[in-house]
């Protein structure tokens, strides 16, 4: 296993609709054809997997159908979007990149993007 540098923004504020997007960029030392991207969430010293996708270079990222993540790739950059976020989901979201094929296997883990989420103000009841 060889180390690889992964860069991501330090902080992002999610939209009022609970959507946060950020770019995860990795310094690919070779010509990888198969890449796996995993988003981890660290909160209160616990790390949980948010979503993961494996893609072939030049193809779209495919997350599971029920995943809260979507993404696109361009060269050594992955543009990740996480949706359905609520205030309780505020935390550090870490991008993990693995170059699966061809060998050698490379692993890179970013410093994390702190995502802040604000629950929208409830709309006042309106009488018609």
């Amino acid at each position: 296993c060889k180390a690889m540098h992964v860069a991501q923004p330090a902080v992002v504020l999610a939209s009022s609709r609970g959507i946060a997007s950020f770019v995860c960029e990795y310094a690919s030392p070779g010509k990888a054809t198969e890449v796996r991207v995993t988003v981890l969430r660290q909160a209160d010293s616990q790390v949980t997997e948010v979503c993961a996708a494996t893609y072939m270079m030049g193809n779209e990222l495919t997350f599971l159908d029920d995943s809260i993540c979507t993404g696109t790739s361009s060269g050594n950059q992955v543009n990740l979007t996480i949706q359905g976020l609520r205030a309780m989901d505020t935390g550090l979201y870490i991008c993990k990149v693995e170059l699966m094929y061809p060998p050698p296997y490379y692993l890179g883990i970013g410093n994390g993007t702190q995502i802040y989420v604000i629950d929208p103000e409830p709309c006042p009841d309106s009488d018609f």
């Epitope: 923004p9 902080v11 702190q114």
Partner: antibody, heavy 116, light 108 residues
Framework: QVQLVQSGAEVKKPGASVKVSCKAS????????ISWVRQAPGQGLEWMGW????????NYAQKLQGRVTMTTDTSTSTAYMELRSLRSDDTAVYYC?????????WGQGTLVTVSS | EIVMTQSPATLSLSPGERATLSCRAS???????LSWYQQKPGQAPRLLIY???TRATGIPARFSGSGSGTDFTLTISSLQPEDFAVYYC?????????FGGGTKVEIK
């Protein structure tokens, strides 16, 4: 090294607006947020809100909602805070700071005096 | 919103003495998101401690932070003349960011 340099002192009349600038250097501007904090004479620190420079999203303190606007110009790595409908109790030193999380670096402060 | 309460409001001590400042949060705060700042008259606040216990760059070892959950402490092991100032705790675990009301450490 990281530096935040703010615009100079302002004197405004009640009802007017003020726009304070904060020029950042020494780091990748878009990777971090900019918070604005104010301090009335002899008082503590009051967080006004912040802008996520990466995407331009903002979050303001509830008591200032509707009166404050925070923006950035990424081409010049400058953040701006505009406060409208000024009142005498808006007289304070206004600081910009890099963050959250953690306000690691602070500007030198801008004194805004509201007086008729 | 998370309310941060600092005590005491004023601490009167002599140089060389130990200062213990308290900060209490109205709800649990992950220690990664608790900071302490020092402010001297006419100056901007300066970060002392972040992550509840990590000293910022250039901060002397006499400053230490501890605590978790809702109770946090800033300790100055031996007060130097330049340490007499106002100290603020602040959380950015949740929005809005909130500061404590401050503790003034004054010369006795």
């Amino acid at each position: 090294q990281v530096q935040l340099v703010q615009s100079g002192a302002e004197v405004k009349k009640p009802g007017a607006s003020v726009k304070v600038s904060c020029k950042a250097s020494g780091y990748t501007f878009t990777n971090y947020g900019i918070s604005w904090v104010r301090q009335a004479p002899g008082q503590g620190l009051e967080w006004m809100g912040w802008i996520s420079v990466y995407n331009g999203n903002t979050n303001y303190a509830q008591k200032l909602q509707g009166r404050v606007t925070m923006t950035t110009d990424t081409s010049t790595s400058t953040a701006y805070m505009e406060l409208r409908s000024l009142r005498s109790d808006d007289t304070a030193v206004y600081y910009c700071a890099r963050g959250p999380p953690t306000l690691h670096y602070w500007g030198q402060g801008t004194l805004v005096t509201v007086s008729s | 919103e998370i309310v941060m309460t600092q005590s005491p409001a004023t601490l009167s001590l002599s140089p060389g003495e130990r200062a213990t400042l308290s900060c209490r949060a109205s709800q649990s705060v992950s220690s990664n998101y608790l900071s302490w700042y020092q402010q001297k008259p006419g100056q901007a606040p300066r970060l002392l401690i972040y992550g509840a216990s990590t000293r910022a760059t250039g901060i002397p070892a006499r400053f230490s932070g501890s605590g978790s959950g809702t109770d946090f402490t800033l300790t100055i092991s031996s007060l130097q003349p330049e340490d007499f100032a106002v100290y603020y705790c602040q959380q950015d675990y949740n929005l809005p960011l909130t500061f404590g009301g401050g503790t003034k450490v004054e010369i006795k």
